[in-house]
Amino acid sequence: ALDTNYCFRNLEENCCVRPLYIDFRQDLGWKWVHEPKGYYANFCSGPCPYLRSADTTHSTVLGLYNTLNPEASASPCCVPQDLEPLTILYYVGRTPKVEQLSNMVVKSCKCS
Amino acid sequence: ALDTNYCFRNLEENCCVRPLYIDFRQDLGWKWVHEPKGYYANFCSGPCPYLRSADTTHSTVLGLYNTLNPEASASPCCVPQDLEPLTILYYVGRTPKVEQLSNMVVKSCKCS
């Protein structure tokens, strides 16, 4: 699986999850998030050669098409597969609110 | 929606579904498919600016991060959203077989 455990160890050049630390204030301008100050959102990148973690029959077909027709610009793309939530603390006036934001952390990638 | 109806009419530069005709024999080397000879598989391409058909909270966050940090190479990617099957005819010896291949045709795209 193209997950953090594999990708962060092996630094694979093809489609893999990459670490990306996002500081809410500095990187997004979100001053309203009190805690955490930032988090590892991660992202997916890298080429998707034929059959690499193909998501659907279409991505398999497109990968083969791209291999046999390399001048074509049609190829699968490396995108998130498994995502996890992030719990944040923010304030409404002086009242603290805890909320779980879904799909905030990329744990693995696929070629789609 | 970034579907064939919209994208094939407007020729949008940002993330959209693009027409792609694949000839089974010529483009894939698949001589075993008897009918159809080819089909419109289509594919997704184009930049994913902030908030364009964002798939998850993560793609929204990543789109904003990329807008504010354009030198970073971390941005969402344009990939298939809705796919449809394709029915094919092939032969096993002299026996005709009809099979429905799932997820063969891209009908719309999203930024993931």
């Epitope: 962060f8 092996n10 670490p19 590892y40 | -």
Partner: nanobody, 119 residues
Framework: QLQLVESGGGLVQPGGSLTLSCAAS????????MSWVRQAPGKGLEWVSV????????IYSDSVKGRFAIARDNAKNTLYLQMNSLKPEDTAVYYC????????????RGQGTQVTVSS
Amino acid sequence: QLQLVESGGGLVQPGGSLTLSCAASGFTFSHYPMSWVRQAPGKGLEWVSVIGSDGGTKIYSDSVKGRFAIARDNAKNTLYLQMNSLKPEDTAVYYCAEGDSRYVRGRTRGQGTQVTVSS
């Protein structure tokens, strides 16, 4: 909050050696790859090296390959860069970076440490 503190820079003669250190805190250091980047006077950030989370995979830019060695001590939350056969063109401010700086450019969190190679 994620913090990175670089140290070990200084003035060294061509052909000399230095070892840079980076103390990391505010995140699970052992889970993530780490990188070194540098910024020469009047130039942009240049990726130097990256090391995998367990220290097994190490990749170097062509400009430092064979001269620099990246290492990490996950027990101490510390990243290192052993710099040998230093050249004047290695003069720069060196920063450690969380993650793999081949993919995410233009972002430094620490103050950096100045390395000057001059006779």
